[in-house]
Interface confidence: low
């Protein structure tokens, strides 16, 4: 003996992406010799039986028996979303609803307010936006592999009505460590299932130059060659070198080369050395005591760096 | 002169961590800068990161920005990497190093002193 239950259809709510492909399926246990009919949030029959009732070449029949019917929406549009209904016209006539939701899929991200000649210490506000997203994205901030906190992401609705633009922006101070930096704006929406939708703004600080005086050999002896090497660094790199030796008022000035060369190294040119590295940001100068030792194998590392 | 005994590498998983420690002996350990270095297989040595005498600079190569973190304890003559999200490119053989200056250094030149190398291999 069949119960009141076993003629009422049941189908199951589904969540699909725009653009994408919905399954909806009715099933029930006792028909009653009663054909299903899907019949869209309009209220416009789609199928009856296996019988298609409107033109829309998006909808096909996946299965039609006395127990079940499935039909699939491909290409889904945000304008599909709402209640379908599956009826069967037994006495009296039993209904189940689906409700359809459609993601929008949040466009690439797009960064703007970038100032290029930034300098260290300065501080740096990005901004980024990303439209299309239902329901609205998240987007998040970071700097390599650092989370940068931007302001909450703000929201406004589309004019479409039913899908947002989503923005955030970014406030922080750049570093040294900063130069050639990308700061990466991500928006996180379940539509992505987890795929990575974002954009990354590279950035550019000017910093004053650094400098280190490395010599070749390492370890130089009396009749050897020895070069000074002043290494520069910084944004924009050292152009100007100025070598100098300590200890005569003035100091003693050598050559504007990034090298300091010693063709033939005596004793008397023991002493310490200079190197102002110079560029458009400032000055940085380091120092070398080069004490020439004696000219026998007999490994020594007197010399030393400042 | 300067001695330089590390240890602390090991295998670890993706996304796993490790801290790597270089003891120092000789010659005063807080006048100096210090360094470490890796050596892929088949690869040049490369800079990872610098750290001048106070500690209160610091230099990273890009890759390990944001990542590792070079540290030192002058009171117990120690260097430190402590490296984190770690990926299979960094596997690598891994070298403290000391200039006999006390500024740190980007190129492997400036270096005088170098430990023995402790290998890190990350893979799962």
């Known amino acids: 003996n069949l119960s009141q239950d076993d003629s009422q259809p049941w189908t199951s709510d589904e969540t699909v992406v725009a653009g994408g492909t919905v399954v909806l399926k009715c099933q029930v246990k006792d028909h009653e010799d009663s054909s299903l009919q899907w019949s869209n949030p309009a209220q416009q029959t789609l199928y009856f039986g296996e019988k298609r009732a409107l033109r829309d070449n998006r909808i096909q029949l996946v299965t039609s028996t006395p127990h079940e019917l499935s039909i699939s929406i491909s290409n889904v549009a945000l304008a599909d979303e709402g209640e379908y209904t599956c009826s069967i016209f037994t006495m009296p006539v039993r209904t189940a609803k689906s409700l359809v939701t459609v993601l929008g899929i949040p466009q690439k991200p797009i960064i703007t307010g970038y100032k290029s000649s930034l300098r260290e210490k300065d501080t740096a506000t990005l901004n980024c936006q990303s439209s299309g997203s239902k329901p609205a994205a998240r987007l998040t901030w970071r700097k390599g592999d650092q989370e940068l906190h931007g302001e909450p992401t703000r929201i406004q609705e589309d004019p479409n009505g039913k899908t947002f633009t989503v923005s955030s922006s970014v406030t922080f101070q750049v570093t040294r460590e900063d130069d050639g930096a990308s700061i990466v704006c991500s928006v996180n929406h379940e539509s992505l299932k987890g795929a990575d939708r974002s954009t990354s703004q590279r950035i550019e600080v000017l910093y004053t130059p650094t400098a280190m005086i490395r010599p070749d050999p390492p370890h130089p002896r009396e009749g050897q060659k020895l070069l000074l090497h002043c290494e520069g660094r910084g944004n924009p790199v050292p152009q100007q070198y100025l070598w100098e030796k300590e200890g005569s008022v003035p100091p003693l000035k050598m050559t504007q080369e990034s090298a300091l060369i010693f063709p033939f190294l005596n004793k008397s040119d023991s002493g310490t050395y200079g190197c102002t590295a110079t560029s458009n940001m400032g000055s940085y100068k380091a120092y070398y005591t080069l004490n020439v030792n004696d000219p026998s194998p007999v490994p020594s590392s007197s010399s030393t760096y400042h | 002169q300067v001695q330089l005994v590390q240890s602390g590498g090991g295998l670890v998983q993706p996304g796993g961590s490790l801290r790597l420690s270089c003891a120092a002996s000789g010659r005063t350990f807080s006048n100096y800068a210090r360094g470490w270095f890796r050596q892929a297989p088949g690869k040049e040595r490369e800079f990872v990161a610098a750290?001048?005498?106070?500690?209160?600079?610091?230099n990273y190569a890009d890759s390990a920005k944001g990542r590792f973190t070079i540290s030192r304890d002058n009171s117990k003559n120690t260097l430190y990497l402590q490296m984190n999200s770690l990926r299979a490119e960094d596997t690598a053989v891994y070298y403290c190093?000391?200039?006999?200056?006390?500024?740190?250094?980007?190129?492997?030149?400036?270096?005088?002193?170098w430990g023995q190398g402790t290998l890190v291999t990350v893979s799962s």
């Open positions: 750290i001048d005498y106070s500690g209160g600079s610091t």
């Open positions: 190093a000391a200039p006999a200056s006390r500024r740190p250094s980007w190129d492997a030149d400036g270096y005088d002193y």
